[in-house]
Interface confidence: low
């Protein structure tokens, strides 16, 4: 899928929301110039795109909801890529210019006489994208136009800042929650010296910059720290972990705050490498309990303890997805595509230049089989439902006592919708309540997953803990057999009685060497030996000194001993 | 069951030219695996000399191996080892192995192997 | 490239007795030690991978042990059908590269 022609998908309604799925994999190094979009995702992009029509039939069936007023969307492809998304919301903001336009009699024909052309409808609202970095560039546009956006996934701590992201709002909390429960694991277990690695862009270089922060006021040291990009190629991941393996044995811990593709080109490489087993990997909630992540490298990803926002699943999405067959599904316009990348087939009736697959699709084929919800699924449907009772509240104070769209609504107003935005709580779809802070951000809670083998040949996520607003509990027994197993992850060891640390120059503070004090030397703190006074000497625990006892000869006393050097 | 079998042994001439063709059955070749090549000079030790991934068909080799070995991919159940200038010092039997990384995990499958004789 | 050395190169023991085989890498290869089993006319069969685990269907007799560049594999309760020639196989992550060691014949009395 090329720059030249983007498909989108349409639903009608007498409101329009605008969302941002990732349908495509992010473009190649080789094609980003011509933001050639990748192969098509089932979790991230077809889900998202089916739970968007299917919410808005919910909704739209809802006699409390909206009354009388039918939600429509315009699903566009992100590509989990600026440039991508930047393109469509233009398409967004260009549907609106034109309505607005429209609306106050500009739109004139050639001629000069006015025109019954009757345009798109404009995006009231945004829901998406789920990239930091991506969802940066979009607000960055549709807040020039007023236009909200509420994001699903999009958890940097930038864009707390409303100074700058006014029309930014999101139902999942921002990365400096997360970044304090990974300090917190590392801590639990007594890891002092880790090594960082983060994807380059947004999402990972704030949360990194959080994490190395608590870390540094936790006396956590951080032995290197690397960055990389999701879609760099092999010899950069290579490289990547040739460094990692030089800080081995001390740093077997290597916090990841990464996208999903990052962690899985890492467990790549120690695949290629020949590397697993070697390091413990503490990932953030773009690994969380992603099976794309780990597929086919189950034994590199051993260990991993990930943080994952906590989402149940949604019963009544699967029921409808999973009954989703291509002859019948055509709102979706990318159904077809992912149908036959997804069974790798060629469906009948598709144009065979188009297809890769020769194998003919069998007619039994099923979405049930190896069915995974996407695991962000409840926050997407969430961000759906809060545009509509931001709606639904907005139309109940321009309109009181009218069902349905009344003039003080038409256009709608992008400003007194945020507002009722962010004034917005209501019981989500897993029971929990969805309410706004004065960030536009949403409450903390966590799993912590821990990804382990089963049996033979059989690996799977745990829930092996939860961090909810900054209290951490884990399930020790659970994540480590044996309390001997618990991995170390430290530079040095603690000294001996009577021996202080000696931190080497240039090397970080959990780095030292431990050196005996003197003979007549005192431990005085963790740094520094002292020198008893004359007349006194060092207690047996070398923590203080104590008087030496005078001891005065009396006649009568044996002569004391002496022996000259040339005694042997 | 799964099963290797190498073929395109025999005798051939010093600086000549062979190819090695190594058929998977019984496996989903498709998937992680990586298969790789080993020669074991009659009454002497085992000796690697290269890998290919499945997945990507990245090769991997020994130093010794390079720009003589070339291995690759050539359908989806065969891969093969090219063998150029050879000497009598390349005559061994030469077994194709899967394993699950370039040597991390060992090769858990072999095949019976092929016997290339150096002669003139 | 990574040298792998294998000692002894050959050892002799009586049924039921133990031998033990020590294969050392020329550079730490970490976990990344495998131990195969040959018998003439055979290719070779994997025993242990990653230096400690042992293959499915392989006995528990046999027992792998050591990481970095010391490497152990311990045959105990040897049977006739352990006569055989023992090779290690060493990966070194940093070249990619394997190395197998020279050999160990077991003999069985």
């Known amino acids: 899928q090329s720059s030249e022609r983007r498909v989108v998908a349409h639903m009608p309604g007498d409101i329009i929301i605008g969302a941002l799925f990732s349908v495509h994999h992010q473009p190649t190094v080789d094609k980003v110039h011509e933001r050639k979009c990748g192969a098509v995702r089932e979790q991230y992009g077809i889900q998202r795109v089916e739970a968007m029509l299917h919410t808005l039939e919910r909704i739209n069936s809802d006699p409390t909801l909206l009354p009388n007023i039918t939600l429509g969307c315009e699903i566009r492809d992100s590509c989990w890529h600026s440039a991508v998304a930047l393109e469509q919301s233009i398409e967004f903001i260009r549907d609106s210019l034109i309505s607005s336009e429209e609306e106050e009699g500009l739109v004139r024909c050639v001629d000069g006489s006015s025109s019954s052309f009757r345009s798109k409808k404009p995006i009231v609202g945004v829901i998406g994208p789920g990239s930091s970095s991506v969802a940066i560039q979009v607000q960055n546009l549709l807040q020039l136009f007023n236009i909200p956006q509420i994001a699903y996934s999009a958890t940097s701590m930038d864009l707390s800042d409303k100074t700058l992201f006014k029309y930014f709002m999101r139902v999942v909390p921002s990365d400096a929650q997360q970044a304090r429960a990974m300090v917190d694991i590392v801590k639990r277990y007594n890891w002092t010296y880790v090594s960082a690695v983060h994807t380059e862009g947004n999402y990972g270089e704030s949360g990194m910059e959080a994490f190395k922060d608590m870390s540094a006021k936790e006396g956590i040291c951080i032995a290197h720290s690397y960055k990389i990009y999701s879609n760099a190629g092999e010899q950069s991941f290579d490289k990547l972990l040739k460094k990692l393996t030089s800080h081995l044995p001390k740093a077997r811990v290597v916090a990841c705050f990464c996208e999903g593709m990052t962690v899985r080109g890492l467990l790549m490489a120690m695949r290629r490498l020949g590397l697993a087993g070697e390091f413990l990997l503490l990932g953030s909630d773009g690994w969380a309990d992603r099976y794309d992540v780990t597929d086919g490298y189950q034994r590199e990803a051993v260990g991993g303890i990930t943080i994952k926002l906590q989402s149940p699943d949604v019963k009544w999405f699967d029921d409808y997805y999973l009954k989703l067959r291509p002859e019948t599904n055509h709102r979706n316009p990318w159904f077809q595509e992912f149908w036959q990348h997804r069974f790798q087939c060629r469906l009948e009736g598709f144009p065979q230049e188009n297809s890769k697959y020769n194998k003919t699709c069998d007619s039994s084929l099923t979405l049930k089989t190896h069915h995974v919800q996407d695991s962000k699924m409840g926050f997407v449907i969430n961000a759906i439902y809060s545009m509509a009772y931001g709606l639904h509240n907005m139309q109940m104070s321009l309109c009181p006592g009218y069902a349905g769209l009344c003039d003080a609504m038409k256009p709608i107003d992008g400003r007194k919708l945020l507002e009722s935005l962010m004034k917005t709580n209501f019981t989500g779809v897993s029971g929990d309540m969805i309410l706004f802070d004065e960030n536009g951000d949403s409450p903390g809670r966590y799993e912590i997953m821990n990804f382990k083998e089963m049996g033979k040949d059989y690996f799977d996520y745990i829930n092996v803990g939860s961090w909810d607003n900054g209290e951490l509990k884990m399930d020790d027994d659970e994540v480590w057999s044996k309390k001997s197993n618990i991995i170390r992850s430290v530079c040095s060891e603690p000294c001996e009685k009577g021996q202080i640390k000696v931190i080497r120059k240039g090397e970080v503070s959990c780095c030292w060497t431990c050196t005996p004090c003197k003979e007549n030397e005192y431990v005085f703190d963790e740094y520094t030996c002292k020198a008893c006074q004359l007349g006194s000497w060092p207690t047996d625990d070398l923590t203080g000194c104590d008087l030496i006892p005078v001891q005065y000869l009396r006649w009568g006393d044996p002569e004391p001993d002496y022996k000259d050097d040339d005694d042997k | 069951q799964q099963q290797l079998e190498e073929s395109g042994g025999g005798l051939v001439k010093p600086g000549g030219t062979l190819t090695l063709t190594c058929k998977v059955s019984?496996?989903?070749?498709?998937?992680?695996?990586?298969m790789c090549w080993v020669r074991q000079a009659p009454g002497k030790g085992l000796e690697w000399i290269a890998c290919?991934?499945?997945?990507?068909?990245?090769t991997y080799y020994a130093s010794w191996a390079k720009g003589r070995f070339t291995s690759s991919k050539t359908s989806s159940t065969t891969v093969t080892l090219q063998m150029t200038s050879l000497t009598a010092a390349d005559t061994a039997t030469y077994f194709c192995?899967?394993?699950?990384?370039?040597?991390?995990?060992?090769?858990?499958?072999w095949g019976p192997g092929t016997l290339v004789t150096v002669s003139s | 490239d990574i040298v792998m050395t294998q000692t002894p190169a050959s050892v002799e023991a009586a049924v039921g007795g133990t031998v033990t085989i020590k294969c050392q890498a020329s550079?730490?290869?970490?976990?990344?030690l495998a131990w195969y089993q040959q018998k003439p006319g055979q290719p070779p069969k994997l025993l242990i991978y990653?230096?400690?685990n042992l293959e499915s269907g392989v006995p528990s007799r046999f027992k792998g042990s050591g990481s970095g560049t010391e490497f152990t594999l311990t045959i105990s309760d040897l049977e006739c059908a352990d006569a055989a020639t023992y090779y290690c196989?060493?990966?070194?992550?940093?070249?990619?590269?394997?190395?197998f060691g020279g050999g160990t014949e077991v003999v069985v009395k």
């Open positions: 290919i991934y499945a997945g990507d068909g990245g």
């Open positions: 019984g496996i989903d070749f498709s998937s992680y695996y990586y």
């Open positions: 990653r230096a400690s």
């Open positions: 550079e730490s290869i970490y976990s990344n």
């Open positions: 192995a899967r394993g699950s990384g370039v040597g991390s995990y060992g090769y858990s499958l």
């Open positions: 196989q060493g990966y070194y992550a940093s070249t990619t590269t394997n190395a």
